[in-house]
Interface confidence: low
Amino acid sequence: SFFFLSFHISNLQFNSSLEDPSTDYYQELQRDISEMFLQIYKQGGFLGLSNIKFRPGSVVVQLTLAFREGTINVHDVETQFNQYKTEAASRYNLTISDVSVSDVPFPFSAQSG
């Protein structure tokens, strides 16, 4: 199962560095977000994330989450993410708002082991 997730990081400012994967700002934010999702979805069904993009608007993060088929639904993806907001603020200094989750209706090409 694949889910498209979008959220705002309201305490960060977007700049052109977030359009360039070679910059420290891009890489640090990518590492933090990637690790954060591993913490949020600790159950065995989580396979990883892909297609991460940063957009203007403070910083808007868009990505796709992959889970084993039948292990989670849209509501639970959103609920678990929202429950992690406080810890995201303390552990990663990321203030998260405007969370949106939707089903990706067809499998896309994602690297697997």
Epitope: S22, D32, F37, Q43, G48, S50, Q111
Partner: antibody, heavy 125, light 110 residues
Framework: EVQLVQSGAEVKKPGASVKVSCKAS????????ISWVRQAPGQGLEWMGW????????NYAQKLQGRVTMTTDTSTSTAYMELRSLRSDDTAVYYC??????????????????WGQGTTVTVSS | SYELTQDPAVSVALGQTVTITCQGD??????AGWLQQKPGQAPVLVLY???SRPSGIPDRFSGSTSGNTASLTITGAQAEDEAEYFC?????????????FGGGTKLTVL
Amino acid sequence: EVQLVQSGAEVKKPGASVKVSCKASGYTFTNYGISWVRQAPGQGLEWMGWISAYNGNTNYAQKLQGRVTMTTDTSTSTAYMELRSLRSDDTAVYYCARDPHILTGYYRGGWFDPWGQGTTVTVSS
Amino acid sequence: SYELTQDPAVSVALGQTVTITCQGDSLRTSYAGWLQQKPGQAPVLVLYGKTSRPSGIPDRFSGSTSGNTASLTITGAQAEDEAEYFCHSRDSNDNYLEVVFGGGTKLTVL
């Protein structure tokens, strides 16, 4: 307690094959992968490859492609690593380690915890 | 040859702070894992991700990452911290994914 217990030491002739086992306990075997790492005497660590205990997907180090095969038996929570056409420079301690295998997309993190106790494989004529 | 570069040896006085570094391109998109290995024993994971320690690892072990360099810091080194430390991360080239290790840093506690 999460634990990986490996099979005993092996002595093999050049050209032979060896199969090392790694029995997992204390966690849900199919929620993780197993990586295999070897360490030649007095040397550093070399990653050999990984297998998903969930679906059997494998990812082998390029230098070992064609010589190594990793398998799992979910009924006994055991992972296996077979190395063929052994050479003297395959003499090493072989370790298995639990691996979260979050490999899709951008996530390149990864860690090995815990490790098996190691299996010494000696290749000598 | 190793795709992550570590200093071969570092020493620290008992109770002092020491930092072990690990450098490599894969660290631009990956946090390092840090392993401790004592002679004749299997490696033990001491640090991974941004700030994570497995249970049982003392909080004197901490880490940081900047650009292509990861650092493991031991604040108040103890005699039992004398060991070899290896960093590792995942590396992806041409969509082929492997795990790479540093060559190891032998830490001596004086």
